[in-house]
């Protein structure tokens, strides 16, 4: 019996088509992805093949102005329109709190939303009961398939799930649910979830009875043969894991941002064994036309976004200096504002011993593309912020050793004075440079804000200590020559859309007046 699994993950609000790098579509003839194009391909496959499932492995939320404005209603609407069969909860589904998940998505979705390792307690338990499920048995043709969901247990550090949701270990939580499916005579089981490729592989290895793993969170691109675009494969598609009980379990992911549609064909025997698995992600490029009815719907929803862009988010009473003459040479108050917003967006009081789990921010000065003049009645709009941060990036959470941070700050000024983008703006860090010294030895003082303290204060950086840092995804991926970050990072979790982080902070503060205050000397 042959099953076709179509899958997406980490779409992050890319409802409209995008450029090849998943930023705003500029030249339509070269654009990719988007739900209208996705629908065309899904329908084409549904017409051609008998047993098809369309699955999403989480993180539909967060990433563009679509989410900022519609807050998840757009996800429910368009996923319903595409007739998704199931979705797993990702960490970003909790970005607007549990209410921001329940109302727009859980109550509106016409498909099951799954996670076996999230357990509700207290007053939330009854409120959320039945709105998401540990598993769902879906009829597919003459057969039934069990889908069991999972979500990163790091979600409390990455999002805002509140205190009434417990995130359990994925493997521990999945096994009893899979066992339950087996007792219900369901012998074809897909684990669909959002914990990253390493955990996907562990689930394939350790959870008895899981036949296929469809994952997300790590934006992993897998491909067999010559890849069709710029993404470099992390392995073959599907990636085959040998389970502890001797079965070959295919593991798949489909990069991110709706650029690809994962396409996996599985042949099962009567016992539910995977006899064969093959496929590849399908690049959703302009050779696939956008479905006209979905496209018309997108254009209708788009109107509200254009109006939102010009509305006031808050006010500044000082000039926000985002000029390259400042931000690539010295501490600039736009850099301070952005870093303060980045830390504020990551306030998570999950442990009494820590005032917060992260206190540090670094930001490449070259990523700040425009100032904001306060003489326009102090008004700040989304449009203004889009000029400052035009690349559609995210502000991510990484774990780095102190020694890696030291290398990063040396790189920050290794060719100082040439107006290059690698000069770092900071938050929760005090750095002193001596530019008379030779490159690679210019950082003379590097103090960082403590986290395991009730009164935050600055302590010298320890080379062997592991620190959490918020930074742009551009830097996490080694951009502007920060190869040491990419090579040496110990953990990387993608965060919220850059503009959204700053806009939320400005809306919260109402009036801002960031200063230059001696963070960089």
């Amino acid at each position: 019996w042959e099953l076709t699994i179509l899958h997406t993950n980490d779409v992050h609000s890319r409802l409209e088509q995008t450029s090849e790098d998943s930023s705003k579509c500029v030249n339509a003839s070269r654009c990719m992805g988007g739900v209208a194009r996705l629908f065309t391909k899904v329908q084409q496959i549904r017409r051609a093949e008998p047993n098809v499932l369309l699955l999403d492995a989480g993180d539909q939320y967060q990433g563009t102005i679509w989410f900022t404005v519609y807050k998840g209603a757009e996800v429910a609407h368009f996923m319903n329109a595409l007739r998704y069969d199931a979705m797993a909860l990702g960490n970003h589904e909790f970005d607007n709190g549990v209410e921001g998940l329940i109302e727009p998505l859980l109550k509106e979705a016409k498909f099951p939303i799954l996670s076996a390792n999230i357990k509700a307690k207290g007053p939330l338990a009854s409120q959320i009961s039945g709105l998401y499920l540990p598993y769902k048995v879906l009829p597919v043709g003459d057969e039934v398939v069990g889908i069991v969901g999972y979500t990163s247990k790091e979600t409390p550090f990455l999002s805002n799930p509140g205190t009434n949701l417990v995130f359990e270990d994925e493997i521990t939580a999945l096994q009893p649910e899979v066992d339950k499916l087996k007792t219900l005579n369901v012998n074809k089981i897909i684990a669909l979830g959002h914990s990253g490729f390493e955990m996907d592989k562990l689930i394939a290895q350790k959870v008895r009875g899981v036949d296929v793993v469809v994952g997300g969170h790590s934006n992993t691109f897998l491909y067999t043969g010559n890849p069709p675009s710029k993404e470099v494969p992390a392995g073959k598609y599907p990636f085959i894991v040998t389970s502890d009980d001797g079965r070959k379990v295919p593991v798949v992911q489909a990069y991110a941002f709706g650029k690809y549609l994962g396409y996996l064909k599985i042949e099962f025997d009567e016992r539910g064994n995977v006899i064969s698995s093959h496929g590849n992600p399908i690049l959703l490029n302009s050779s696939i036309p956008e479905d006209p009815s979905i496209k018309a719907d997108i254009n209708k929803w788009r109107i509200k976004l254009d109006n939102y862009s010009t509305q006031e988010l808050g006010k500044t009473i000082v000039y926000l200096d985002g000029s390259s003459q400042s931000c690539r040479f010295r501490e600039c108050n736009m850099g301070n504002l952005i870093c303060d917003a980045m830390i504020n967006n990551n306030l998570r009081h999950t442990d009494e011993m820590f005032w917060n789990h992260v206190s540090m921010c670094i930001l490449n000065g070259g990523g700040i593309r425009s100032p904001i003049d306060e003489r326009n009645n102090g008004t700040i709009t989304w449009e203004n912020l889009a000029a400052v941060l035009p690349f559609g990036g995210t502000f991510d959470l990484v774990q780095l050793k102190g020694s890696t941070l030291k290398k990063a700050f040396e790189h920050s000024v290794h060719r100082y004075g040439q107006s290059t983008g690698e000069f770092l703006q900071v938050g929760g860090i005090h750095v002193v440079y001596d530019l008379s010294r030779k490159p690679g030895d210019r950082v003379v003082k590097l103090d960082v804000l403590c986290t395991k303290c009730r009164v935050p204060s600055y302590d010298p950086l320890k080379m062997d200590e592991v620190y959490k840092v918020i930074l742009p995804n551009f830097l996490a991926n080694g951009g502007d020559g920060f190869q040491m970050i990419k090579d040496e990072l110990l953990r990387h979790d993608s965060g919220d859309q850059d503009i959204n982080v700053v806009s939320t902070y400005i809306s919260k503060m109402k009036v801002i007046y960031p200063a230059v205050e001696g963070r960089i000397k």
């Epitope: 057969e143 016992r271 995977v274 064969s276």
Partner: antibody, heavy 114, light 107 residues
Framework: EVQLVQSGAEVKKPGASVKVSCKAS????????MNWVRQAPGQGLEWMGR????????FYSQKFKGRVTMTVDKSTSTVYMELSSLRSEDTAVYYC???????WGQGTTVTVSS | DIQMTQSPSSLSASVGDRVTITCRAS??????LNWLQQKPGGALKRLIY???SLDSGVPSRFSGSGSGTEYTLTISSLQPEDFATYYC?????????FGGGTKVEIK
């Protein structure tokens, strides 16, 4: 649990036909196909062909084409294999086996003798 | 038709021995190979499917490996109940074909 139950032993004369049945249970019968395999005394296994229950599609090994017919009765989840123009070398145990031979019938002994 | 050449045709081994049986296909069959066990008296049982996946209930001392045209069944430590005849089966293309079998006997 998958179970395949075959009909009893047959003794046939050369030139006659034999029809062996295989009743399946414990799985979604219509979603899969069934194989027929035979084993002559003291010999190895020989694949004869397969039938896809839902559509009645068949694929026969060239060696048996024109002599073998596989049919299905979906109402009783039963597959049949008929072999005609029997000769002595068709004396064998005939097995039905699920789509990728994960489960086997108990075998039906067919003896062709004058 | 794809020919499956299985070797050895028979072997004698003692309890606890490591036993290896090989199947060579006349052309590339990908991963489309099963290993079957037939006990005296006729009962057939699949041990390995898709080259290396172990059927449920089959002891972990059985393992399969290989690719392209060369495939192997290994019994890491032969047990009394393992004395039987073993067959490989390719299902990469029609007609499916079996190896000639390997009879594993007590030394």
């Amino acid at each position: 649990e998958v179970q395949l139950v075959q009909s009893g032993a047959e003794v046939k004369k050369p030139g006659a036909s034999v029809k062996v049945s295989c009743k399946a249970s414990g799985y979604t019968f219509t979603a899969y196909f069934m194989n027929w395999v035979r084993q002559a005394p003291g010999q190895g296994l020989e694949w004869m062909g397969r039938i896809y229950h839902n559509l009645g599609d068949t694929f026969y090994s060239q060696k048996f084409k024109g002599r073998v017919t596989m049919t299905v009765d979906k109402s009783t989840s039963t597959v049949y294999m008929e072999l005609s123009s029997l000769r002595s070398e068709d004396t064998a145990v005939y097995y039905c086996a699920t789509s990728y031979v994960g489960d086997w019938g108990q075998g039906t002994t067919v003896t062709v003798s004058s | 038709d794809i020919q499956m050449t299985q070797s050895p045709s028979s072997l004698s081994a003692s309890v606890g021995d490591r036993v290896t049986i090989t199947c060579r296909a006349s052309q590339d069959i990908g991963d489309s190979l099963n290993w079957l066990q037939q006990k005296p008296g006729g009962a057939l049982k699949r041990l390995i499917y898709a080259t290396s996946s172990l059927d449920s209930g089959v002891p972990s001392r059985f393992s399969g490996s290989g690719s392209g045209t060369e495939y192997t069944l290994t019994i890491s430590s032969l047990q009394p109940e393992d004395f039987a005849t073993y067959y490989c089966l390719q299902y990469a293309s029609f007609p499916w074909t079996f190896g000639g079998g390997t009879k594993v006997e007590i030394k």
